[in-house]
């Protein structure tokens, strides 16, 4: 099964401070961050489509989620599957197409005021704090009204960047996804060679802020390809 591939037990670089500078070499950490397969289904045509193996939703496209292709099938074999549209069954938010979220086991529109709220108990992913299952049962708890209308602050658990407040993006931090600051000018950024490759990172940086792009630092042009430092620079 794919689980046997989950053996990448070292994190080569420690993360930079939130929204900050580059990491430093660090000691190995026991981790199984996901499967680093080359390519992805982003550039595969329909007539040449091959299922893209995955371990995390982030490894799939924005209109996909990671799951076993057959219900009750081998839990170890997971591939990127097309997201579920409104009124389709779901088990977690990532299964629903953008603009929807999983409520009571059904994908529903997120165009409701309370969806944007940072939920009590520092939750931004649970949206209404429902206990959602495929069976569709729900145990609602009362939310304080002051929590509605506010988006996730720095460090809040999130699903997508739209869950985070202005100036923040939703990025992976080891086994969780949290709101992190969008990068400022001069800060180190990650240049993705391939669309979608950001999902493979254990520690994910945000993108560069408005008017900035992630480009190789001028004084690093002579460095080897692998050690080139990218920073957020003005267009």
């Amino acid at each position: 099964t794919l689980n046997s591939v989950l053996n990448s037990n070292a994190i080569k670089n420690l993360p930079p401070p939130l929204g900050g500078a580059a990491g430093h070499p660090g000691s190995a950490v026991s981790a199984a961050p996901g499967i680093l397969y080359p390519g992805g289904n982003k550039y595969q045509t329909i007539d040449n489509y091959q299922p893209y193996p995955c371990a995390e939703d982030e490894e799939c496209g924005t209109d996909e989620y990671c799951a076993s292709p057959t219900r009750g099938g081998d839990a170890g074999v997971q591939i990127c599957l097309a997201c579920r549209k409104r009124r389709k069954r779901c088990m977690r938010h990532a299964m629903c197409c953008p603009g929807n979220y999983c409520k009571n086991g059904i994908c529903v529109s997120s165009d409701q005021n309370h969806f944007r709220g940072e939920i009590e108990e520092t939750i931004t992913e649970s949206f209404g704090n429902d206990h959602s299952t495929l069976d569709g049962y729900s145990r609602r708890t009362t939310l304080s009204s002051k929590m509605y209308h506010t988006k996730g602050q720095e460090g809040s658990v999130c699903l997508r960047s739209s869950d985070c407040a202005s100036g923040l993006c939703c990025a992976r931090h080891f086994w969780s996804k949290i709101c992190k600051p969008v990068l400022k000018e001069g800060q180190v950024c990650t240049k993705h060679r391939r669309k979608g490759s950001h999902g493979l990172e254990i520690f994910q940086r945000c993108y560069c802020g408005e008017g900035l792009s992630c480009r190789i630092q001028k004084d690093h042009h002579q460095a080897s390809n692998s050690s080139r430092l990218h920073t957020c620079q003005r267009h």
Epitope: L6, I11, L14, P15, P17, L18, G20, G26, V29, S30, A31, A32, P33, G34, C54, A55, E56, D57, C66, A75, Q78, M91, R92, H93, A94, C102, E121, T122, I123, E125, S126, N129, D130, H131, S132, R139, T141, Q153, E154, G155, S156, V157, L159, H173, F174, W175, S176, I178, I202
Partner: antibody, heavy 118, light 107 residues
Framework: EVQLLESGGGLVQPGGSLRLSCAAS????????MSWVRQAPGKGLEWVSA????????YYADSVKGRFTISRDNSKNTLYLQMNSLRAEDAAVYYC???????????WGQGTLVTVSS | DIQMTQSPSSLSASVGDRVTITCRAS??????LNWYQQKPGKAPKLLIY???ALQTGVPSRFSGSGSGTDFTLTISSLQPEDFATYYC?????????FGGGTKVEIK
């Protein structure tokens, strides 16, 4: 209300195995990363392992790497910790905890006691 | 691994006292610092996350500050129910590590 309830602890001989379970309710379990944290009698807290919401990524403390396996069944809202080759130093109260903001442990179970003794 | 050093390891105080506990990380952890309260025989309870954010339901007499390597938990006016052990924890880089704890006892 978020609730986490651990079970499966008990007395086991050195070299033996145990499987701990943590039943979760009151929140959308599949959306949250979860961890196991332990506390030896009279000692401080020690993080043991963590798993992402989908179960695709697992992390371990060096002290348990290769012996413990964290897993989850999102259809059952349950977190597991399979503990093999148990040692005396593994004896502790084991808590399951949910990952909240800044990867803090925002909700904890009541704990289950694991005793390793011959 | 990142070492978390808490001080003092224990302190005696009276109801109404202002209590300060410090936590130092062996390297910068940005604001990935959380504080917990634990009473005997009970599970820990989250007080402060992200160095300074008060967890929902926690009394406002608890506050946290700091960034980088040095952090502080302050109880502005100690109440009878605050006598417990307090732990800091870094969540910046695995393995997540806790401080040794500070036991707050009645004077």
């Amino acid at each position: 209300e978020v609730q986490l309830l651990e079970s499966g602890g008990g007395l086991v001989q050195p070299g033996g195995s145990l499987r701990l379970s943590c039943a979760a309710s009151g929140f959308t379990f599949a959306n949250y990363a979860m961890s196991w944290v332990r506390q030896a009698p009279g000692k401080g807290l020690e993080w043991v392992s963590a798993i992402s919401g989908s179960g695709g990524s697992a992390y371990y403390a060096d002290s348990v790497k290769g012996r413990f396996t964290i897993s989850r069944d999102n259809s059952k809202n349950t977190l597991y910790l399979q503990m093999n080759s148990l040692r005396a130093e593994d004896a502790a109260v084991y808590y399951c905890a949910r990952s909240g903001s800044f990867l803090s442990f925002d909700s904890w179970g009541q704990g289950t006691l694991v005793t390793v003794s011959s | 691994d990142i070492q978390m050093t808490q001080s003092p390891s224990s302190l005696s105080a009276s109801v109404g006292d202002r209590v300060t506990i410090t936590c130092r990380a062996s390297q910068s952890i940005s604001r990935f610092l959380n504080w917990y309260q634990q009473k005997p025989g009970k599970a820990p309870k989250l007080l402060i996350y992200g160095a300074s954010a008060l967890q929902t339901g926690v009394p406002s007499r608890f506050s946290g500050s700091g960034s980088g390597t040095d952090f502080t938990l302050t109880i502005s006016s100690l109440q009878p129910e605050d006598f417990a052990t307090y732990y800091c924890q870094q969540s910046y880089i695995p393995p997540l590590t806790f401080g040794g704890g500070t036991k707050v006892e009645i004077k």
